[in-house]
C-alpha cells in the first residue's frame, strides 16, 4: 500500500521536511503532489511524468519544493503556513490511480525563557509568590523545575495560565530553592536560568546547647544559642531576667553554686520583626564523693558460694550503676540487683566470674566510677592431665612426667607408682629406666583451700620390644563418594616411626590419602568401593618393629544401574520368561519388579511361564540400598510374538 512518511513529522520553521514515499508502484505513468487531503487541481504543487521526465509546477508551487524520481517531495525553508496534509496522486502505467496522504506540523524555534516574580522577599507563612515564565508563546508547553526536579505534589503549589504561572501559597522556608521554567514544543525545548527564592522566616524558638543543665563547681559554663532564621538572627542573653550581652555565645569561667539560675536566650529577626526566647535552668553542684565496692566474701568457692557486692557510700536519691569487664551487666539468672541497684549478688559463682567489677554513682551532671574489684574465686582441681601422652618406653631412657590440673589456688601434686607415694612435686623424673619401672603411675592434685582432690592414672610399659599395634577407625561403614575415614595406629609410643600398608603394599600416592599426627593417622577422603582393602599399620624403633592385624574397610556403595539378563527382548508365545536382575551394591540391594508400571514381586528373578502377546510391555527392575539410602532402576521392553510369525525370536528358557 502506498504510504507517505513525513521526516520529521514536527518541523521547525526555516528547516526542511521530506515527504518520503513508501511502496511506490513499479510501472508508472506519472505522479503529482497536492496541498490538502485530496486531489484538487487548484492546489496542485507539482506533477511529474515518467516518460518525459518532465516536472510541471502547479498553482500551489512555491519554489521551495523539490520532487525526486522516487516521488518523494522535499519542502525547504518551511513556514508556518506549510502545516497540514499533502496528497500524492500516482498514475500507474495502466492508468490506474493510487493516492496517499501524509502530513506534518510546523512549529517555531523557541527562545530561551526567563522567570519573573511578583515578590522577591516573601515572608514565611504569610506571603504568596507568583512566578511567571516569559515570554508567552503560542502552542508551547510550560514546565517547571524545583532544584532540577519536577514539581512536587502540594496543595500550596498551583499552576495557572496554561502552566505558565507557578504560584506558591503561604511560602515556607522549604520553598527556598532553585526554580526554573521550561518551554517546549515538538521541535525545541529551552530552559530558563534558575531563580533562587529567598524566603524570610524565623526566628524559630532558639536552641541552647549543650543540653546538660547540671554542672560542678569550678567548671566553665559555655552556652551557645541558635535559632533558624533568615536573615540570621541577632542574639541577647539574660540571667535571672537581667540582660547580660548581645552575643550568640555566653561564657562564664569557674562557676560557683551562685551561678545557678534561669538563663534566657532571645533571638530577633530584623526583617520579619519577630522575637523568640528559650529559657534553661542551670544548677551548679558541689563535688560528690568517689564510690567504692565492698564484698561479703573475698574468696568464694566455685559452684558453692554466693557473693554480694555493695556500692558505697549510700546516698539518697542517687542512681547506682554496675559494670562487669567494662560492659554493662549481662542478663543472667545468676546476677541479681537489689531494689535500689546498690547491691549486686552473684549466685553460685564460677571461675569466669572474676570480673573486674565497677560501680558508679550518677548525679545530675556526670557518673563517678569506683576503682575496679576482682573476685578471687576458688575452684578445682579439675582432673589432672599427665604429659607426655606416650605409654611405651625403651629401657635406658629417662622418664619425665608432668602433671597439671586447673585450680585456684594452684594445686599441690603427689605422684604414686602402683599405689605407693613417691614425691610431692608437679613433675616426676626417673633416669635410665628399666622394665621394672613398668606400672601404674598416678598423679594426685589437691586444692588446700577447697579441700578437693582429683587423680589421673597412666599405665607405663618399659620394654625393648614394641607392642603389637592395633588400628582404630572413626567410621566403620563409610558411604562411597560421601564419607571420609580416619585410621589411627595405637598406641602412641615415644621415638617411634609409624608405617602403613594397603593390601600388603606401601601406600599409593593419591590426593585422597593423607597422613598426619606423625604418620600415626591415615585419612581417606571421599572413599570409593576400591578402598575396601586390608589396611595394616606398623610401628618401629631402632631395636624393634611390629605390625597390626589387617583391618578391612567395609565401604557401602551402590546400587549401580542394574543389568537384566538374558539380553533378549523378543520372545515366542508359549515360551517361559525368566529375567534376572543384578546391581553392584554393598550391602546387597533389595530387588523389585514392575510390568507396565504395575508392582510385581520383590525378588531378584522374575519368572512367567508360557508367555503370550498379552505379556508385551515394559519390564522394570528397581534396586534399593537401605544402608546408602540410594535407589536405581532399568527398564527393558519385551515383545511376545505369536509362534512362527517372526524369525530370530528367542524360544525362552
Amino acid at each position: 500500500k502506498l504510504t507517505i512518511e513525513s521526516t520529521p513529522f514536527n518541523v521547525a520553521e526555516g528547516k526542511e521536511v521530506l515527504l518520503l514515499v513508501h511502496n511506490l508502484p513499479q510501472h508508472l505513468f506519472g505522479y503529482s503532489w497536492y496541498k490538502g487531503e485530496r486531489v484538487d487541481g487548484n492546489r496542485q504543487i507539482i506533477g511529474y511524468v515518467i516518460g518525459t521526465q518532465q516536472a510541471t509546477p502547479g498553482p500551489a508551487y512555491s519554489g521551495r519544493e523539490i520532487i525526486y524520481p522516487n516521488a518523494s517531495l522535499l519542502i525547504q525553508n518551511i513556514i508556518q503556513n506549510d502545516t497540514g496534509f499533502y496528497t500524492l496522486h500516482v498514475i500507474k502505467s495502466d492508468l490506474v490511480n493510487e493516492e496517499a496522504t501524509g502530513q506534518f506540523r510546523v512549529y517555531p524555534e523557541l527562545p530561551k525563557p526567563s522567570i519573573s516574580s511578583n515578590n522577591s522577599k516573601p515572608v514565611e507563612d504569610k506571603d504568596a509568590v507568583a512566578f511567571t515564565c516569559e515570554p508567552e508563546t503560542q502552542d508551547a508547553t510550560y514546565l517547571w523545575w524545583v532544584n532540577n526536579q519536577s514539581l512536587p505534589v502540594s496543595p500550596r503549589l498551583q499552576l495557572s495560565n496554561g502552566n505558565r504561572t507557578l504560584t506558591l501559597f503561604n511560602v515556607t522556608r522549604n520553598d527556598t530553592a532553585s526554580y526554573k521554567c521550561e518551554t517546549q514544543n515538538p521541535v525545541s525545548a529551552r530552559r530558563s536560568d534558575s531563580v533562587i527564592l529567598n524566603v524570610l522566616y524565623g526566628p524559630d524558638a532558639p536552641t541552647i546547647s549543650p543540653l546538660n543543665t547540671s554542672y560542678r563547681s569550678g567548671e566553665n559554663l559555655n552556652l551557645s544559642c541558635h535559632a533558624a532564621s533568615n536573615p540570621p538572627a541577632q542574639y541577647s542573653w539574660f540571667v535571672n531576667g537581667t540582660f547580660q550581652q548581645s552575643t550568640q555565645e555566653l561564657f562564664i569561667p569557674n562557676i560557683t553554686v551562685n551561678n545557678s539560675g534561669s538563663y534566657t536566650c532571645q533571638a530577633h529577626n530584623s526583617d520579619t520583626g519577630l522575637n523568640r526566647t528559650t529559657v534553661t535552668t542551670i544548677t551548679v553542684y558541689a563535688e560528690p564523693p568517689k564510690p567504692f565496692i565492698t564484698s561479703n566474701n573475698s574468696n568464694p568457692v566455685e559452684d558453692e558460694d554466693a557473693v554480694a557486692l555493695t556500692c558505697e557510700p549510700e546516698i539518697q536519691n542517687t542512681t547506682y550503676l554496675w559494670w562487669v569487664n567494662n560492659q554493662s551487666l549481662p542478663v543472667s539468672p545468676r546476677l541479681q540487683l537489689s531494689n535500689d541497684n546498690r547491691t549486686l549478688t552473684l549466685l553460685s559463682v564460677t571461675r569466669n566470674d572474676v570480673g573486674p567489677y565497677e560501680c558508679g554513682i550518677q548525679n545530675e551532671l556526670s557518673v563517678d566510677h569506683s576503682d575496679p574489684v576482682i573476685l578471687n574465686v576458688l575452684y578445682g582441681p579439675d582432673d589432672p592431665t599427665i604429659s607426655p601422652s606416650y605409654t611405651y618406653y625403651r629401657p635406658g631412657v629417662n622418664l619425665s612426667l608432668s602433671c597439671h590440673a586447673a585450680s585456684n589456688p594452684p594445686a599441690q601434686y603427689s605422684w604414686l607408682i602402683d599405689g605407693n607415694i613417691q614425691q610431692h612435686t608437679q613433675e616426676l623424673f626417673i633416669s635410665n629406666i628399666t622394665e621394672k619401672n613398668s606400672g601404674l603411675y598416678t598423679c594426685q592434685a589437691n586444692n588446700s583451700a577447697s579441700g578437693h582432690s582429683r587423680t589421673t592414672v597412666k599405665t607405663i610399659t618399659v620394654s625393648a620390644e614394641l607392642p603389637k599395634p592395633s588400628i582404630s577407625s572413626n567410621n566403620s561403614k563409610p558411604v562411597e563418594d560421601k564419607d571420609a575415614v580416619a585410621f589411627t595406629c595405637e598406641p602412641e609410643a615415644q621415638n617411634t616411626t609409624y608405617l602403613w600398608w594397603v593390601n600388603g603394599q606401601s601406600l599409593p600416592v593419591s590426593p585422597r590419602l593423607q597422613l598426619s599426627n606423625g604418620n600415626r593417622t591415615l585419612t581417606l577422603f571421599n572413599v570409593t568401593r576400591n578402598d575396601a582393602r586390608a589396611y595394616v599399620c606398623g610401628i618401629q624403633n631402632s631395636v624393634s618393629a611390629n605390625r597390626s592385624d589387617p583391618v578391612t574397610l567395609d565401604v557401602l556403595y551402590g546400587p549401580d544401574t542394574p543389568i537384566i539378563s538374558p539380553p533378549d527382548s523378543s520372545y515366542l508365545s508359549g515360551a517361559n520368561l525368566n529375567l534376572s536382575c543384578h546391581s553392584a551394591s554393598n550391602p546387597s540391594p533389595q530387588y523389585s519388579w514392575r510390568i507396565n508400571g504395575i508392582p510385581q514381586q520383590h525378588t531378584q528373578v522374575l519368572f512367567i511361564a508360557k508367555i503370550t502377546p498379552n505379556n508385551n510391555g515394559t519390564y522394570a527392575c528397581f534396586v534399593s540400598n537401605l544402608a546408602t539410602g540410594r535407589n536405581n532402576s532399568i527398564v527393558k521392553s519385551i515383545t511376545v510374538s505369536a509362534s512362527g510369525t517372526s524369525p530370530g525370536l528367542s524360544a525362552g528358557a
Epitope: 505513468f29 486531489v39 487548484n42 511524468v49 510541471t56 498514475i91 502505467s93 495502466d94 490511480n97
Partner: antibody, heavy 121, light 106 residues
Framework: EVQLLESGGGLVQPGGSLRLSCAAS????????MGWVRQAPGKGLEWVSS????????SYADSVKGRFTISRDNSKNTLYLQMNSLRAEDTAVYYC??????????????WGQGTLVTVSS | DIQMTQSPSSLSASVGDRVTITCRAS??????LNWYQQKPGKAPKLLIY???SLQSGVPSRFSGSGSGTDFTLTISSLQPEDFATYYC????????FGQGTKLEIK
C-alpha cells in the same frame, strides 16, 4: 496544432476482423498515452482501450478483452486497434484520443472525429 | 466495476440560467472525475478534470465540484453554444462514462 485522424472503419460481417488506424500530429506522440473510445448509435460514450507511450502497458474494457488488440508505431506516429471476432454490439463510432502529458488524474484532452464501424450480416 | 449514474438524463433551460448536472459513483473515486461536452456529430470535448480543474481554453462559467461519490458540473450562466450532451467519466479503473445528460433549449 494537435490533430488525430481515424481511418479503417466500414461494414464487416459478424465474426470478421477490422483494423483501425489513428494518425497523430502536432505533439510528441512517442511520449503520450493514447486511447480508444466508442459510441454506439444514439448511445453514450464507452471507453475501449488505452496504451502506454512505450507499448508495454495496455488496458481493455471487459467487453472487448481477448478480441481487440491496441498497438502503436511511434516511428509512424500511428495508433492501431485490431478488432477480431466482431459482434453486432461492436457497431459504433470509434474515437482515437490523447491523454495529456500532465495527466492528473487521467483524462482525454484531444479527440479525433471518429470512424464508423458497422457489424452486420 | 465502478458504475457512474448521471442525473437528470435530460434538462431544458434558457440562456442565462444556472444549470447543475450531478454524477454519482457506485464507490468512492476520490477526485478522479472528468466532465466532457459533446455536440451532435462531433467528438467529445474535455471541460473539467480532477473534479474541479478547468481545462485550458474552457470558459470560466463551467465549474466542477465534489469528491468521493458525489460530483457536480455547474454552468453559471447558460450560453447558446452550451446546449449539448454532457458526460462524466471516472478516471479510476476502467475509465467508465456516465450515460450522459442532454441539455436542451427551453
Amino acid at each position: 496544432e494537435v490533430q488525430l485522424l481515424e481511418s479503417g472503419g466500414g461494414l464487416v460481417q459478424p465474426g470478421g476482423s477490422l483494423r483501425l488506424s489513428c494518425a497523430a500530429s502536432g505533439f510528441t506522440f512517442s511520449s503520450s498515452y493514447m486511447g480508444w473510445v466508442r459510441q454506439a448509435p444514439g448511445k453514450g460514450l464507452e471507453w475501449v482501450s488505452s496504451i502506454g507511450s512505450g507499448s508495454y502497458s495496455t488496458s481493455y474494457a471487459d467487453s472487448v478483452k481477448g478480441r481487440f488488440t491496441i498497438s502503436r508505431d511511434n516511428s509512424k506516429n500511428t495508433l492501431y486497434l485490431q478488432m477480431n471476432s466482431l459482434r453486432a454490439e461492436d457497431t459504433a463510432v470509434y474515437y482515437c484520443a490523447r491523454y495529456p502529458s500532465v495527466p492528473f488524474p487521467p483524462h482525454l484532452d484531444y479527440w479525433g472525429q471518429g470512424t464508423l464501424v458497422t457489424v452486420s450480416s | 466495476d465502478i458504475q457512474m449514474t448521471q442525473s437528470p438524463s435530460s434538462l431544458s433551460a434558457s440562456v442565462g440560467d444556472r444549470v447543475t448536472i450531478t454524477c454519482r459513483a457506485s464507490q468512492s473515486i476520490s477526485s478522479y472525475l472528468n466532465w466532457y461536452q459533446q455536440k451532435p456529430g462531433k467528438a467529445p470535448k474535455l471541460l473539467i478534470y480532477a473534479a474541479s480543474s478547468l481545462q485550458s481554453g474552457v470558459p470560466s462559467r463551467f465549474s466542477g465540484s465534489g469528491s468521493g461519490t458525489d460530483f457536480t458540473l455547474t454552468i453559471s450562466s447558460l450560453q447558446p453554444e452550451d446546449f449539448a450532451t454532457y458526460y462524466c467519466q471516472q478516471a479510476g479503473n476502467p475509465h467508465t462514462f456516465g450515460q450522459g445528460t442532454k441539455l436542451e433549449i427551453k
